[in-house]
């Protein structure tokens, strides 16, 4: 598996891909040490109480969605907002908290992941090395007959996070997008200073997992603004 390679969102690419020791799940891997692409990999930090700018839902945590903070507000300014609980109004599935989906404008329980079971077409392409089985990739489309699919595994190229298996998100790696692990507690995460800054990252990290948020590590409060380390922490 690509376990160690794409751990902490991969920030180390495949060298010891299979069974290699490039860090372990709990490790806080730094961002691609030594990568020298101009403008690339600039992980900027902000105070954790400021809103988190976003362009799409995938950039927010699992308990957040991306939208304009004011009703009918400027569509160009979007931030990550807290997800809507059951029986709250919604316009799309991502607005509802995990375990719920948007039905007729209201967040309802997704009993057995109802909406995620939409008909999906599988498009599988092989890539990676001979020993790797992580070459599945699926794209969501609506079909008239029921089909089952294999979601993209770690390292699979993806279009959006819904293409990736559970526990993975779709994030940039070099100049493409691949499925990477959602961050666990204690792992280094990225806070963006302004909307669009994520576009400068050659290696984009996933968001923090459910129940976690990206905050300044407590023992780093004294550090200078530019070197503050953010990690995934319990709410």
């Amino acid at each position: 598996t690509l376990n160690s390679v794409l751990n902490s969102n991969a920030i180390k690419n495949l060298p010891p891909p299979l069974g290699g020791a490039a860090g372990h799940p709990g490790s806080a891997v730094s961002a691609a040490p030594g990568i020298l692409y101009p403008g690339g990999n600039k992980y900027q930090t902000i105070d954790n109480y400021q809103p988190y700018p976003c362009a799409e839902d995938e950039e927010c945590g699992t308990d957040e969605y991306c939208a304009s903070p004011t009703r009918g507000g400027d569509a160009g300014v979007q931030i990550c907002l807290a997800c809507r609980k059951r029986r709250k109004r919604c316009m799309r599935h991502a607005m509802c908290c995990p375990g719920n989906y948007c039905k007729n404008g209201i967040c309802v329980s997704s009993d057995q992941n109802h909406f995620r079971g939409e008909i999906e077409e599988t498009i599988t392409e092989s890539f990676g090395n001979d020993h790797s089985t992580l070459d599945g990739y699926s794209r969501r489309t609506t079909l008239s007959s029921k089909m089952y699919h294999t979601k993209g595994q770690e390292g699979s190229v993806c279009l959006r996070s819904s293409d990736c298996a559970s526990g993975l998100c779709c994030a940039r790696h070099f100049w493409s997008k691949i499925c990477k692990p959602v961050l666990k507690e204690g792992q280094v995460c990225t806070k963006h200073r302004r909307k669009g800054s994520h576009g400068l990252e050659i290696f984009q990290r996933c968001y923090c997992g459910e129940g976690l948020s990206c905050r300044i590590q407590k023992d780093h409060h004294q550090a200078s603004n530019s070197s503050r380390l953010h990690t995934c922490q319990r709410h």
Epitope: L2, V5, L6, K12, N13, L14, P15, P16, P17, A32, P33, G34, I35, L36, Y37, P38, G40, I123, E125, F127, G128, Y137, R139, G155, S156, V157, C158, L159, R172, H173, F174, W175, S176, K177, I178, G199, L200
Partner: antibody, heavy 119, light 108 residues
């Protein structure tokens, strides 16, 4: 199956322009970073430029910076390389190549299109 | 930029023999971001190895990559007639991406 087909090559005078195209099929084009690599006759490979999956990010080799522009149209699954102020040393076979995804190495290449800059 | 120097320039061997191709970088290649390609006359290059040691899809296991830092090696354990070609190394750990000048593997 994955296919990359370049077109637009030909003979052009120094200082003139040319636009190469690369039509992609058989894969989810809008998820992949794409590159141009060239090879002068009888010589080795030279990386020319890269464009990110969404076209927001581009980098160029110093030898072509300011003269070449790389763009993509994800709705048409097509890449473009606009080459201006061409020089004799730009004479080469130009390949478009797909990035592997998990590595910035190139797993699929087109057949190449020859650009000859000569007076 | 990182300059990659391949040696030897030409390697003459017979089918069945072991081939060892070297690629040396002018500075350390970040995270072993190094790839190897094979190119035959009139054809586009073919990816063999990425990440210094990971075989690309469909590549026979007689091809293996090793090395780290500044010294990398492509080994073909037992040469087949179709292996005679030009081999290039490529680094993608820093901008610009660069290729070595190539090693020609010819039949003795």
């Amino acid at each position: 199956q994955v296919q990359l087909v370049e077109s637009g090559g030909g003979v052009v005078q120094p200082g003139r322009s040319l636009r190469l195209s690369c039509a992609a099929s058989g894969f989810t084009f809008s998820s992949y970073g794409m590159h141009w690599v060239r090879q002068a006759p009888g010589k080795g490979l030279e990386w020319v430029a890269v464009i990110s999956y969404d076209g927001s990010d581009k980098y160029y080799a110093d030898s072509v910076k300011g003269r070449f522009t790389f763009s993509r149209d994800n709705s048409k699954n097509t890449l473009y390389l606009q080459m201006n102020s061409l020089r004799a040393e730009d004479t080469a076979v130009y390949y478009c190549a797909r990035e592997l995804g998990i590595a910035a190495s190139f797993d699929y290449w087109g057949q190449g299109t020859l650009v000859t800059v000569s007076s | 930029e990182i300059v990659l120097t391949q040696s030897p320039g030409t390697l003459s061997l017979s089918p069945g023999e072991r081939a060892t191709l070297s690629c040396r970088a002018s500075q350390s290649v970040s995270s072993n971001y190094l790839a190897w390609y094979q190119q035959k006359p009139g054809q586009a290059p073919r990816l063999l190895i990425y990440g210094a040691s990971s075989r690309a899809t469909g590549i026979p296991d007689r091809f293996s990559g090793s090395g780290s830092g500044t010294d990398f090696t492509l080994t073909i354990s037992r040469l087949e007639p179709e292996d005679f070609a030009v081999y290039y190394c490529q680094q993608y750990g820093s901008s610009p991406i660069t290729f070595g000048q190539g090693t020609r593997l010819e039949i003795k």
